[in-house]
């Protein structure tokens, strides 16, 4: 009774198409698969950034797989062939592992990389990224930003840099068509006559870094003798109403501070007839229905009412 064996996949490699971290892992079928013509061979692929504690694992029938990687670090991957139990009259058979690695040969010391990279997608319309120059780099150092997301043929360079003392410290991006809800990759590299500059790689999804405008048109309406309805409008721009959460801060007679988080453009406040002054501010953020994360807007302008009788009228300023 001969033991069934299978070879590992051939020509296993990691291919960098120049998309700043979006890599292709590809391989060819193992040698000597003739005995298993009726069988669908599967592959178990494991990969990770070097230094990571855990492997990501994929089981696939394909001969390729694509994913995003942190090119600040190296990448290691391994793959083996799986013969399902249906092919072997019993238990699953696995080949030995085929292994490969990939890294971008680093230039310059780590301190020359940009620091404190931050990107904000203002009002779901305008992307702006900013950074600080690396430690100890000279003023002749210039940084360049490149970006790519699925839909672009190749990585593009920033064309509108923000400068300080002649150095690029940020990028204002052009209109980015069909660019949200997908991984957006960035590389900031640099050049200096003095010394080589280390590149930095980043990724994000645009909808997760949105900072909306603050809400507008804050109003008060007396609902009953002890209730006032606070209302506001969604900020101008492309973000639909269903995508907002709001935080309200209310001050009553300079003493009571109420804070609340709500999903609609209204909040009903219990008051007493003695209330002399009411002020509130609101800010907005993209909610969990439209993103995994988001940045609070600035606070709206403060809306206040001072006067004798809150019960008499709708208060609109």
């Amino acid at each position: 009774d001969t033991e069934i064996k299978v070879n590992p996949p051939q020509d296993f490699e990691i291919v960098d198409p120049g998309y700043l971290g979006y890599l292709y892992l590809q391989w060819q079928p193992p040698l000597s698969l003739d005995h298993f013509k009726e069988c669908t061979v599967e592959y178990e692929l494991k990969y990770r950034n070097i230094g990571s504690e855990t492997w990501k694992t994929i089981i696939t029938k394909n001969l390729h797989y694509k994913d995003g990687f942190d090119l600040n670090k190296g990448i290691e991957a391994k793959i083996h062939t799986l013969l399902p139990w249906q092919c072997t009259n019993g238990s699953e058979v696995q080949s030995s592992w085929a292994e490969t690695t990939y890294w971008i040969s680093p230039q310059g010391i780590p301190e020359t990389k940009v620091q404190d990279m931050d990107c904000v997608y203002y009002n779901w319309q305008y992307l702006l990224c900013s950074w600080k120059p690396g430690i100890g780099v000279l003023l002749d150092t210039n940084y360049n930003l490149f970006y790519w997301y699925e839909g672009l043929d190749h990585a593009l360079q920033c064309v509108d840099y923000i400068k300080a003392d002649g150095q690029n410290i940020g990028c204002r991006f052009p209109y980015l068509e069909a660019s949200d809800y997908k991984d957006f990759y960035i590389c900031v590299n640099g050049s200096s006559e003095n010394k080589p500059i280390r590149s930095s790689y980043f990724t994000f999804q645009l909808q997760n870094i949105v900072k909306p405008l603050p809400p507008v048109y804050l109003t008060f309406t007396r609902e009953s003798s002890c209730e006032i309805k606070l209302k506001w409008s969604i900020p101008l721009g492309p973000i639909p109403a269903r995508c907002f959460d709001y935080e309200i801060e209310i001050r009553e007679d300079d003493t009571t501070l109420v804070t609340a988080t709500v999903e609609n453009e209204t909040y009903t406040l219990k008051t007493t007839n003695e209330t002399r002054q009411l002020c509130f501010v609101v800010r907005s953020k993209v909610n969990i229905y439209c993103s995994d994360d988001g940045i609070w807007s600035e606070w709206s302008d403060k809306q206040c009412w001072e006067g004798e009788d809150l019960s008499k009228k709708t208060l609109l300023r």
């Epitope: 990770r48 504690e53 404190d116 931050d118 990724t203 994000f204 999804q205 997760n208 994360d293 940045i295």
Partner: nanobody, 126 residues
Framework: QVQLVESGGGLVQPGGSLTLSCAAS????????MGWFRQDPGKQREGVAA???????IYADSVKGRFTIYQDNAKNTLDLQMNSLKPEDTAMYYC????????????????????WGQGTQVTVSS
């Protein structure tokens, strides 16, 4: 160069408290998500608590109500206040940061973090 250095571990009795601190250098912690993880010898590293750049926090069910994660932006440290400690909290505790993904939500998955400290040992025993 990014560096994360944990401190504050030690031996504590059940029911006691400890505060772990993670000092970050080479970047501003307020811009990125960070987390605390722990690992027993021979076991998988598990998420304990994490915070994103907007200050939102998440906790493992086993530590909810007992542990608190907070960032001290002035000192550039990430702290973990641990109260009502139990013997099962004994482990090596690691601080981690994700400097690659900008604006991603807090996560307790080790695969979401690329930079790690060396760890500090916490032992809960009478």
């Amino acid at each position: 160069q990014v560096q994360l250095v944990e401190s504050g571990g030690g031996l504590v009795q059940p029911g006691g408290s400890l505060t772990l601190s993670c000092a970050a250098s080479g970047y501003r912690i307020s811009l990125y998500k960070m987390g605390w993880f722990r690992q027993d010898p021979g076991k998988q590293r598990e998420g304990v608590a994490a915070v994103d750049r907007n200050g939102r926090t998440i906790y493992a069910d086993s530590v909810k109500g007992r542990f608190t994660i907070y960032q001290d932006n002035a000192k550039n440290t990430l702290d973990l206040q641990m109260n009502s400690l139990k013997p099962e909290d004994t482990a090596m505790y690691y601080c981690a940061a994700d400097l690659w993904r900008i604006g991603s939500p807090a996560s307790l998955s080790p695969t979401d973090y690329g930079d790690w400290g060396q760890g500090t040992q916490v032992t809960v025993s009478s």
